[in-house]
Amino acid sequence: MMTGTIETTGNISAKKGGSVILQCHLSSTMAQVTQVNWEQHDHSLLAIRNAELGWHIYPAFKDRVAPGPGLGLTLQSLTMNDTGEYFCTYHTYPDGTYRGRIFLEVLESSVAEHSARFQIP
């Protein structure tokens, strides 16, 4: 039975040209996390972190995506095109798959607010 929940940074905004941390956290389960996938709004893979094989960043994003902190992902040199949904998929044993959603808005304004509060989607 899947007892866990994914907490995410929810809806966040960041400044064009800046960086932002995408973070998901699995709680309320003792399941072992075997792999975390990070996908972009068009469902293209940004990165995978496998517990036994480490991180693999998709080459097209290599210069703008950094692994971590933890199982999270840091997006750098943000453009307006980065606005949209991001998904974390946690493969766990024995529970199975958990999925979280984050919405990132990239703002032109220099007063872009980093509202990185944790919430359950």
């Epitope: 480490g54 693999h56 290599k62």
Partner: antibody, heavy 117, light 107 residues
Framework: DVQLQESGPGMVKPSQSLSLTCTVT?????????WHWIRHFPGNKLEWMGF???????KYNPSLKSRISITHDTSKNHFFLKLNSVTSEDTATYYC??????????WGTGTTVTVSS | DIQMTQSPASLSASVGETVTITCRAS??????LAWYQQKQGKSPQLLVN???TLAEGVSSRFSGSGSGTQFSLKINSLQPEDFGSYYC?????????FGAGTKLELK
């Protein structure tokens, strides 16, 4: 077009070290992907040996961990396999390959290594 | 280690036929399975990744399916160039493991 080519001695004596080079053309090994070594035994079994990432970190097959080392020379766009204390059981065709999310989308042509005294 | 069991070990078929090769993982690998074709004296070539995504330049006569522990590769309307060996491989954990292979021969 990315191409990979293995090179090294075709014959190695038992207890010695096997050293192979993979030359990559058409793509920089520091620009992404992982760079793997795989071998194909005479009985047709394929065995993944390990990889070096674009940043230089390595992962090895636990069955070989005490004997294997994978390194790279980014200035020459080469990566290398060193396997210590070889026996006749290490006789195989050795391939280098490019890894995308740990499957292999480009392979070298392969080089046959025989371990014999 | 996640073991990959491929069947059949060998298969005889005629040009124009449709064949299916199966691969079973010893534990759940979700959709993290690749298929390769290898012709005599050549290096393996990627056909399918993530269980069903056809690699670039691969004929649409090939199709992959399955998830969890059961997977299959289907080849429609066999052509002379399709004969050779086929291997599955999981891309989910360390060590990455291949199946023992299926040799597809001309009947």
């Amino acid at each position: 077009d990315v191409q990979l080519q293995e090179s090294g001695p075709g014959m190695v004596k038992p207890s010695q070290s096997l050293s192979l080079t993979c030359t990559v053309t058409g793509y920089s090994i520091t620009s992404g992907y992982d760079w793997h070594w795989i071998r194909h035994f005479p009985g047709n079994k394929l065995e993944w040996m390990g990889f070096i990432s674009d940043s230089g970190s390595t992962k090895y097959n636990p069955s070989l961990k005490s004997r294997i080392s994978i390194t790279h020379d980014t200035s020459k766009n080469h990566f290398f396999l060193k396997l210590n204390s070889v026996t006749s059981e290490d006789t195989a065709t050795y391939y280098c390959a490019r890894g995308s999310y740990w499957y292999f989308d480009v392979w070298g042509t392969g080089t046959t290594v025989t371990v014999s005294s | 280690d996640i073991q990959m069991t491929q069947s059949p070990a060998s298969l005889s078929a005629s040009v124009g036929e449709t064949v299916t090769i199966t691969c079973r993982a010893s534990e759940n690998i979700y959709s993290y399975l690749a298929w390769y074709q290898q012709k005599q004296g050549k290096s393996p070539q990627l056909l399918v990744n993530n269980a069903k995504t056809l690699a670039e330049g691969v004929s649409s006569r090939f199709s992959g399916s399955g998830s969890g522990t059961q997977f299959s590769l289907k080849i429609n309307s066999l052509q002379p160039e399709d004969f050779g060996s086929y291997y599955c491989q999981h891309h989910y954990g360390n060590p990455l493991m291949f199946g023992a292979g299926t040799k597809l021969e001309l009947k």
